[in-house]
């Protein structure tokens, strides 16, 4: 632990002014694991002037950083790049004349205290004023800056020409696109100072490339994957003062796939479990030994979990007997195609026979054993049939 500091497994605090520290505290190699440090408290360190790019990076678990009544003048732009857990920063009563929002833009800070610093009135600190105005909490800080006449002005009153928030405008076509197709988004940004523009595509799976000039940009997404349905794409304009973004949600249409269909399991009811993916929402059709299975209060489709374009459910059977043994086929279809899977179900042996499958079971099955198509958003029981409302246009569909 550095001189003038005390260290525990999760905290470092340096408050002794003598002899004091001249650099940000670093732990010796074989001491406490820096990843476990969650709080660093520094006070009364007049000779601590700089936080360098690599000073804080080892403290990846850091949540609270306090440097008060010290000599901090400069913070490197990427000083907190690796400290994504940072929530509270307190730089009260230091020697900061400027501070860029770039230090903090990637952090989800709940508190940034900057009281008592000799900020210079310029566009560089306008973001702090904007941040203050955005906070509706009553405990806003009394921040000041020195103008050209070396006069202290409340930051709340600061007016600087040609220094405002940028704007982003995303000109997106209808962002409903078929799997495998491509799409181009265009975005324009404006502002003074002139903003930079970038795309935030999150964890987009599909291949994408962007062309960006200062105020115009395009994003081309090719061979769009069904996994990207529901994802948000944002165009971001950023300058010294702050950022603006315009976002669209991507909807990908694709043919259904039955990713899971298994033999029945018994719980409160018997259940033939399935998982279906598709967009628009597929209609489900069940067949029993090749014949339409019209749903009833005794046999019906239940969807238990819907995860955007994925549906987990059951063909639920109430008290099935040997008469229900046989082949169950599930067909899922929408206008982009259809998928089909089949399982054999054995619920019960024949009466008077040890619980073994009877190879003759199809002989005694009556046709059209009570599901018609079931829109998988509808899980209510209905007598005899469940109408399908989801297959809107499948011209050109083959299976």
């Amino acid at each position: 632990c550095p001189t003038s500091c005390k260290c525990s497994a999760s905290r470092i605090w340096c408050s002794d002014p003598s002899p004091g520290i001249v650099a940000f505290p670093r732990l010796e190699p074989n001491s406490v694991d820096p990843e476990n440090i969650t709080e660093i408290f520094i006070a009364n360190q007049k000779r601590l002037e700089i936080i360098n790019e690599d000073d804080v990076e080892a403290y990846v678990g850091l949540r609270n950083l306090t440097i008060v009544d010290s000599g901090l003048k400069f913070v490197a732009h990427k000083a907190f790049l690796k400290n994504s857990n940072l929530q509270h920063i307190n730089f009260t009563r230091n020697k900061l004349t400027s501070l860029s929002r770039k230090h903090f833009r990637h952090l989800d800070l709940s508190e940034l205290i900057l009281v008592g610093n000799p900020f210079t009135c310029s566009c560089d600190i306008m973001w702090i004023k904007t941040l203050q105005e955005a906070k509706s909490s009553p405990d806003t800080q009394d921040l000041y800056c020195l103008n050209e006449s070396s006069k202290n002005i409340p930051l709340a009153n600061l007016q600087i020409p040609n220094c405002g928030l940028p704007s982003a405008n995303l000109a997106a076509p209808n962002l409903t696109v078929e799997e495998g197709k491509s799409i181009t988004l265009s975005c324009s940004v404006a502002g003074d100072p002139v903003p930079n523009m970038y795309w935030d595509v999150g964890n987009l799976v599909s291949k994408h490339m962007n062309e960006t000039s200062h105020t115009q940009g395009s994003l081309r997404i090719t061979n769009i994957s069904s996994d990207d349905s529901g994802k948000q794409i944002s165009c971001v304009a950023e300058n010294l003062v702050g950022e603006d973004q315009d976002s669209v949600n991507l909807t990908v249409h694709f043919a259904p796939t039955i990713t899971f269909l298994e033999s029945p399991t018994s719980d409160h009811h018997w259940c033939i479990p399935f998982t279906v993916k598709g967009n628009p929402k597929p209609a489900l059709q069940w067949f029993y030994n090749g014949a339409i299975l019209n749903e009833s209060k005794y046999i019906c489709t239940k969807i238990h979990v819907t995860n955007h374009t994925e549906y987990h459910g059951c063909l639920q059977l109430d008290n099935p007997t040997h008469m229900n043994n046989g082949d169950y086929t599930l067909i899922a279809k929408n206008e982009y195609g259809k998928d089909e899977k089949q399982i054999s179900a054995h619920f019960m042996g024949w009466p008077g026979i040890d619980d073994g499958a009877n190879p003759n079971y199809p002989d005694v099955i009556y046709e059209d054993y009570g599901t018609a198509a079931n829109d998988i958003g509808d899980t209510t029981n209905r007598s005899n049939e469940i109408p399908s409302t989801d297959v809107t246009d499948k011209t050109g569909r083959e299976h």
Epitope: Q285, I292, E335, Q342, A372, V391, D393, K394, T395, R397
Partner: antibody
């Protein structure tokens, strides 16, 4: 009980059109494709195409493209197949069949005779 | 279009004896979804066809278990384990994998 009931026999002159109907019952009509198949006297079966009764979307066999029209009236759960510019070799029994890639259900057939 | 070729074209069978019908397609009937849509139909004089077997080997609801289907890819077989009098008729194989759907020539008649 699934049933497909077709309209009665027709006699038409060459160049005329014929419209055969197929009324479905016992299942949700709009949920399943309806196919049309024909069988010339003493011959085999020939697939003509299908209609999706929900959307009205159709797909016709190349041979009948431009000459066949498949439609439906969902309010009465009925599918129609109209064949235009009839020729003598269109004389056949026309069947509606459904409801998926195996033809589990068939209408009783409609005999269309084309003769001058 | 896929051509479906059936053999033999005629099959005299003694009641109670087995019978076998072969069907060959001009290309594979395995669909990209993993299913093979090869179906067998029976037609009796003056009646519409009736589905016996769907997707190679699945017996349709109500079809007696003396009917069975087998095969894969391009070669398929319908077997009747013990022919009964009511089995007399024309048998068609049919593919529903690729449009246009096509049928075997169906000349085969059990006498």
């Amino acid at each position: 009980q699934v049933q497909l009931v077709q309209s009665g026999a027709e006699v038409k002159k060459p160049g005329a059109s014929v419209k055969v109907s197929c009324k479905a019952s016992g299942y949700t009509f709009t949920a399943y494709d309806m196919h049309w198949v024909r069988q010339a006297p003493g011959q085999g079966l020939e697939w003509m195409g299908w209609i999706d009764p929900n959307s009205g979307g159709t797909r016709y066999a190349q041979k009948f493209q431009g000459r066949v029209t498949m439609t439906r009236d969902t309010s009465i759960s009925t599918a129609y197949m109209e064949l235009h510019r009839l020729r003598s070799d269109d004389t056949a029994v026309y069947y509606c069949a459904g409801v998926t890639s195996w033809f589990a259900y068939w209408g009783q057939g409609t005999l269309v005779t084309v003769s001058s | 279009d896929i051509v479906m070729t059936q053999s033999p074209l005629s099959l005299p069978v003694t009641l109670g004896q087995p019978a076998s019908i072969s069907c060959r397609s001009s290309q594979s009937l395995l669909h990209s979804n993993g299913n093979t849509y090869l179906n067998w139909l029976q037609q009796k004089p003056g009646q519409p066809p009736r589905l016996l077997i769907y997707k190679i080997s699945n017996r349709f609801s109500g079809v007696p278990d003396r009917f069975s289907g087998s095969g894969a890819g391009t070669d398929f077989t319908l077997k009747i384990s013990r022919v009964e009098a009511e089995d007399v008729g024309v048998y068609y194989c049919m593919q529903g994998t690729h449009e246009p759907y096509t049928f075997g020539q169906g000349k085969l008649e059990i006498k």
